[in-house]
Amino acid sequence: MMTGTIETTGNISAEKGGSIILQCHLSSTTAQVTQVNWEQQDQLLAICNADLGWHISPSFKDRVAPGPGLGLTLQSLTVNDTGEYFCIYHTYPDGTYTGRIFLEVLESSVAEHGARFQIP
């Protein structure tokens, strides 16, 4: 039975040209995390594998940095980066847990971090 929950940074905003850290945390399970995938809508951004380490998709290499931890740092943000991001935790023996983050990239200097929330 899958007992874990994914806690994410929730709905967040950041300024155009700035950077942002996408973070997820898996709790309430003893399952082993074997791999974490980061996706933006229908694009694979990066993978962090327990054995192989990080793989950043070549098309995002200039603007995506691994970490901190299992998180992902997006740099040189543009308004086109606005949208949904997903952290997909592959675990053994539980299976797959998915967390969602919505990022809004703002033209102005009004950028706030949203409250944390949980996805069961």
Epitope: T34, Q35, E39, D42, Q43, L44, I47, N49, D51, L52, H55, S57, P58, S59, H90, Y92, P93
Partner: antibody
Framework: EVQLLESGGGLVQPGGSLRLSCAAS????????MSWVRQAPGKGLEWVSA????????YYADSVKGRFTISRDNSKNTLYLQMNSLRAEDTAVYYC???????????WGQGTLVTVSS | DIQMTQSPSSLSASVGDRVTITCRAS??????LNWYQQKPGKAPKLLIY???SLQSGVPSRFSGSGSGTDFTLTISSLQPEDFATYYC?????????FGGGTKVEIK
């Protein structure tokens, strides 16, 4: 240099068994998922089975489920495919392939031919 | 199971031509789509992974695009060594499935 070398193929009668091996070298074998893919003569590619780096998770195509068993010995850097209750439609070249991050097959062996015929 | 449909099944082209092969998934597979090249009697060779990432050592004339259900492999200027059969493969979920292949022949 990454190398994958399959062996164990041959001629077997319907209902018979065969065990394929794939000897790996040039990389940390236990860090990679591995797959078996087959190709019937003149046909396309068909995925058969996969196994996680630790061997804890295994996956099978419906066409071989219950008849084939994938396994690995990380101390010997070797992947196996035990094939039982073989049928004529299992006739194919069998390839082993390395799967970094479980999502693509970046290195393949040269293949070993399995022929099931009476 | 996710079905992968490749088109065309074969095509004739000349050296220097721009060649496009398409692959359609029966459901969304995000960008978990790979392309392989196979020559007669040889093992498949990875060209493109994760829809658009060029595998190390593969010439830059090969490119991949698409996401969701529709994907494309493009060879910008066909070379003599490119005459082969090309397969797409989804790695979104098991069972992993391949397209039926596209044979690129000399015109």
């Amino acid at each position: 240099e990454v190398q994958l070398l399959e062996s164990g193929g041959g001629l077997v009668q319907p209902g018979g068994s065969l065990r394929l091996s794939c000897a790996a070298s040039g990389f940390t074998f236990s860090s990679y998922a591995m797959s078996w893919v087959r190709q019937a003569p003149g046909k396309g590619l068909e995925w058969v089975s996969a196994i996680s780096g630790s061997g804890g998770s295994t996956y099978y195509a419906d066409s071989v489920k219950g008849r084939f068993t994938i396994s690995r010995d990380n101390s010997k850097n070797t992947l196996y495919l035990q094939m039982n209750s073989l049928r004529a439609e299992d006739t194919a070249v069998y390839y082993c392939a390395r799967e970094p991050y479980d999502y693509w097959m970046d290195y393949w062996g040269q293949g070993t031919l399995v022929t099931v015929s009476s | 199971d996710i079905q992968m449909t490749q088109s065309p099944s074969s095509l004739s082209a000349s050296v220097g031509d721009r060649v496009t092969i398409t692959c359609r998934a029966s459901q969304s597979i995000s960008s978990y789509l790979n392309w392989y090249q196979q020559k007669p009697g040889k093992a498949p060779k990875l060209l493109i992974y994760a829809a658009s990432s060029l595998q190390s050592g593969v010439p830059s004339r090969f490119s991949g695009s698409g996401s969701g259900t529709d994907f494309t492999l493009t060879i910008s200027s066909l070379q003599p060594e490119d005459f082969a059969t090309y397969y797409c493969q989804q790695s979104y979920s098991t069972p992993l499935t391949f397209g039926g292949g596209t044979k690129v022949e000399i015109k």
